[in-house]
Interface confidence: medium
């Protein structure tokens, strides 16, 4: 059903009577109608809603609505549905964001890093080295570093001091008469925290832009996306550089070699010598499903001088 | 539940003045074009004016043209017809209608003017 | 301005038969026509726009039919709350109204 609308502060639009060849101004129709009749020296214009599938985002004097853009493409979803005010709009789930004009998983800041800032749907998740006094020791893209326990507000003494991937352990003072025990939630890392490499075990997930591979040859691995990895410092393990972070080092150049240690493979990630990492600027905008219709539509974007 | 309600009909004499008002409810006002319609008593209707949704464009049946003037206050959800020059044929139940692509979907029950000395 | 004639100016039919009212216009109003109806002491009611469009929550034993001048309002079977007088408008050249046709109880 037709309906005769307009907003409160209607303007108008020129429109040649083909009939008279005069030229008259009507009233434009509001946004979510276009005009199914223009004015003439007897008859006001008349509106119509917009068809299922058309919007008109303003009020204009056009004589068809927009075309919505088409479904969202696969990973993205609905941000915004095709109606008669608004085009469909498309938008990253959650957990990923705009890359491209599809949709990457957040980075997912490894061990020793947390997260700086909250990835977000046109915004990639920013990681940065845990500060001293905190840890991070489980890879997370929404995590930020966790401070040590205090072991002296529990009356406990730190039996193994925290690093940047773990917590500090606190036990009791050693005495002669009862072993040493950790307190409860709290775990012992046996191994040596002092390595060159960073062991990750190939299961652990691997961060993106720290990928394996599964060929022996040495691959450099630098995808853009380790630009999200904010603060120019490496994850770095060595005691010598705990304490000291550099700001100005960039980051490190990644390779993945692929190890044998008797029967368990393990991919090393070895830092090289870094070369600068530079990232693309990230649009804000919000992502459209292709257009249907005539293609000279994308060209001009919906404008239309009876339309703004 | 759209809802018109016309008021300010009344007797006047001859060459007198009516305000006649018209409260919308139920729907945005701001957003329709209004008509005024008259009915004589016992005679067919008889379109009287119409008001473009802003104010900006009003229309009149050449028997009150120069006599009659439509307004709207947007703010108030208020169609008027300001009625000057009264003669004993404007005597008429006078309806305010919502405008549906220049016909008239909704009315009021209307308001009687009498012009009679 | 156009005129808009309306016949017959009353119509005695019993209810379940067929009204048949007419409306002429002086000159072509294309298919820019609308019916309506009233009852005493109310207001009209919109019945059918554009010649052939029933108004929301109108029956569909209203029907309207033609274009150009000549316009026809059909109820295929009067119900009892039927009889009134039944209006035909035009929007061409602005509004005008037809004089009404009355469809009464025989």
């Known amino acids: 059903q037709p309906e005769q609308k307009a907003s409160n502060l209607i303007g108008t639009y020129r429109h040649v009577d083909r009939a008279t060849g005069q030229v008259l101004t009507c009233d434009k129709c509001p946004a979510g109608t276009y005009v199914s009749e223009h004015c003439t020296n007897t008859s006001l214009r008349v509106c119509s809603s917009c068809p299922v599938g058309t919007f008109t985002r303003h009020e204009n004097g056009i004589e068809k609505c927009h075309d919505c853009s088409q479904p969202c493409p696969w990973p993205m979803i609905e941000k915004l549905p095709c109606a008669a005010l608004t085009d469909r709009e498309c938008t990253c789930p959650p957990g990923m964001f705009q890359s491209n004009a599809t949709c990457a998983p957040h980075t997912v800041c490894p061990v020793g890093w947390g997260v700086r800032k909250k990835g977000t749907e046109t915004e990639d998740v920013r990681c940065k080295q845990c500060a001293r006094g905190t840890f991070s020791d489980v890879p997370s893209s929404v995590m930020k570093c966790k401070a040590y326990t205090d072991c002296l507000s529990q009356n406990l003494v730190v039996i193994k001091p925290g690093t940047k991937e773990t917590d500090n352990v606190c036990g009791t003072l050693p005495s002669f008469s009862s072993s040493t025990s950790p307190s409860p939630g709290t775990a012992i890392f046996p191994r040596p925290e002092h390595m060159e490499t960073h062991e990750v075990p190939s299961s652990t997930y691997v961060p993106k832009g720290m990928n394996s591979t599964e060929s022996n040859s040495s691959a450099s691995v630098r995808p853009k996306v380790l630009s999200s990895i904010q603060e120019g410092t490496v994850p770095d393990n060595t005691s010598s550089a705990r304490g000291k972070e550099d700001v100005n080092k960039t980051l490190p150049n990644l390779q993945v070699v692929n190890h044998q240690q008797g029967p368990h493979h393990r991919h090393i990630l070895k830092l090289l010598p870094s070369m600068e990492a530079t990232g693309g600027e990230k649009s804000s905008t919000p992502i459209k499903g292709p257009k249907r219709g005539h293609p000279r539509q994308n060209l001009h974007k919906h404008f239309d001088i009876n339309e703004h | 539940e759209v809802q018109l309600l016309e008021s300010g009909g009344g007797l006047v004499q001859p060459g007198g003045s009516l305000r006649l008002s018209c409260a919308a409810s139920?729907?945005?006002?701001?957003?329709?074009?209004m008509h005024w319609v008259r009915q004589a008593p016992g005679k067919g209707l008889e379109w009287v004016s119409v008001?473009?949704?802003?104010?900006?464009?009003?229309v009149y049946a050449d028997s009150v043209k120069g006599r009659f003037t439509i307004s709207r206050d947007n703010s108030k959800n208020t169609l008027y017809l300001q009625m000057n020059s009264l003669r004993a044929e404007d005597t008429a139940v006078y309806y305010c209608a919502r405008d549906l692509s220049n016909y008239m979907d909704y009315w009021g029950q209307g308001t009687l003017v009498t012009v009679s000395s | 301005d156009i005129q808009m004639t309306q016949s017959p100016a009353t119509l005695s039919l019993s209810p379940g038969e067929r009204a048949t009212l007419s409306c002429r216009a002086s000159q072509t109003v294309s298919n820019y026509l609308a019916w309506y109806q009233q009852k005493p002491g109310q207001a009209p009611r919109l019945l059918i726009y554009?010649?052939?469009n029933r108004a929301t929550g109108i029956p569909a034993r209203f029907s309207g039919s033609g274009s150009g001048t000549d316009f026809t309002l059909t109820i295929s079977s009067l119900e009892p709350e039927d009889f009134a007088v039944y209006y035909c408008q035009q929007r061409s050249k602005w509004l005008s109204f037809g004089g009404g046709t009355k469809v009464e109880i025989k």
């Open positions: 139920g729907f945005t006002f701001s957003e329709y074009t």
């Open positions: 008001i473009s949704s802003s104010g900006g464009r009003t």
């Open positions: 554009d010649a052939s």
